[in-house]
């Protein structure tokens, strides 16, 4: 069971300083950007990490969304990442749901995290190349210091 | 409780191949992945590779990538590792391991090699 | 790849003193590193992952420590069934690399 806490606006970046965002074609995608252009390129550059409360903590439970003209949250039905048209909902009765992250640091690096999927145990989202694109993955993956999987996440609140 | 029983020592000449089995007995969660070790006489223990028994994706340590294949039986919960073109350097005792992921009390994930075959002794020798 | 240098390589000492084993990696890992014993003709046995923390059923004696590079075990009051062969394994990147090992003898 998760229950909607309070939530906060973030940029996401990867650790070649990458930030995340959302194209045109809802898309979520790494782009090297200045400051500038990560505050021009706004709201697709802010995520909106809402926080749940875990029946059974596991971590920091989250779902990312973003409001461009709709609000979509990033979910990974059938391993496969991608924004939906949809709210967070307020609760979730269940243990695992597409939406819901669990945010952990990494041990020793407070500012860097890792996003491990609630659904599918072992399987993290990652920045991975596809031919000239940065893109959001969902990854399993078993070498925990690859850093693929590791994010920094910078309040705007 | 978890083990892991291997398949019997062997003798092999110089040049030839050798595969050994590794079956799951006892209840097992999904999410594990079989690993490799050996060990030489006398000497440490050295990682040879992997495989992840869900889409049978394998990592292998870069010495060993030309000579070696992991395979896993889904069917029969065994794995298997078989090395080729082998050398007296080989002889060594081959353990299976299972890699899992252990959590702290914050959930935060680890893996570690927990269950651990009795090894099985190679022997190469012409 | 990631090196692990383990030190001592061997190490004599008496039951109830306590013992410090080392391991040093070549490059950040976090906390992803394990500890194990051998025993002669045994598999390895899993003593603490995580960098510190205990598996289940091995006595609080033994305890683990260390982020990033350098890592330590330590055995407070050794036992004779302590005396064996501990290895350091990291886990954070392939290849997985194994520390040398440290005998530790009876002295």
């Known amino acids: 069971y998760f229950g909607k806490l309070e939530s906060k606006l973030s940029i996401i970046r990867n650790l070649n300083d990458q930030v995340l965002f959302i194209d045109q074609g809802n898309r979520p995608l790494f782009e090297d950007m200045t400051d500038s252009d990560c505050r021009d390129n706004a709201p697709r550059t802010i995520f909106i990490i809402n926080m749940y409360k875990d029946s059974q903590p596991r971590g920091m439970a989250v779902a990312i969304s973003v409001k461009c003209e709709k609000i979509s949250t990033l979910s990974c039905e059938n391993r496969i990442i991608s924004f939906k048209e949809m709210n967070p909902p307020d609760n979730i009765k269940d243990t695992k749901s597409d939406i819901i992250f669990f945010q952990r640091s990494v041990p020793g690096h407070d500012n860097k995290m890792q996003f491990e999927s609630s659904s599918y145990e072992g399987y993290f989202l990652a920045c991975e190349k596809e031919r000239d694109l940065y893109k959001l993955i969902l990854k399993k993956k078993d070498e925990l210091g690859d850093r693929s999987i590791m994010f920094t996440v910078q309040n705007e609140d | 409780q978890v083990q892991l029983v291997q398949s019997g020592a062997e003798v092999k000449k110089p040049g030839a191949s050798v595969k050994v089995s590794c079956k799951v007995s006892?209840?097992?969660?999904?999410?594990?992945?079989f690993h490799w070790v050996r060990q030489a006489p006398g000497k440490g223990l050295e990682w040879m590779g992997r495989?992840?028994?869900?889409?049978?994706?394998?990592k292998y340590a870069e010495r060993f990538k030309d000579r070696v294949t992991m395979t896993e039986d889904t069917s029969t919960d065994t794995a298997y590792m078989e090395l080729s073109s082998l050398r007296s350097e080989d002889t060594a005792v081959y353990y299976c391991?299972?890699?899992?992921?252990?959590?702290?009390?914050?959930?935060?994930?680890?893996?570690?090699?927990?269950?651990w075959g009795q090894g099985t002794l190679v022997t190469v020798s012409s | 790849d990631i090196q692990m240098t383990q030190s001592p390589s061997s190490v004599s000492a008496s039951v109830g003193d306590r013992v410090t084993i080392t391991c040093l990696a070549s490059?950040?890992?976090?906390?992803?590193l394990t500890w194990y014993q051998q025993k002669p003709g045994k598999a390895p046995k899993l003593l603490i992952y995580?960098?510190?923390k205990l598996q289940d059923g091995v006595p609080s004696r033994f305890s683990g420590s260390g982020s990033g590079t350098d890592f330590t075990l330590t055995i407070s009051s050794l036992q004779p069934e302590d005396f064996a062969t501990y290895y350091c394994?990291?886990?954070?990147?392939?290849?997985?690399?194994f520390g040398q090992g440290t005998k530790l003898e009876i002295k």
């Open positions: 495989i992840d028994p869900e889409d049978d994706s394998t």
């Open positions: 490059e950040d890992i976090y906390t992803y």
């Open positions: 391991t299972t890699w899992r992921i252990y959590r702290d009390s914050s959930g935060r994930p680890f893996y570690v090699m927990d269950a």
């Open positions: 006892g209840e097992i969660s999904t999410g594990y992945y």
């Open positions: 394994l990291q886990g954070s990147k392939f290849p997985l690399t």
């Open positions: 995580g960098a510190n």
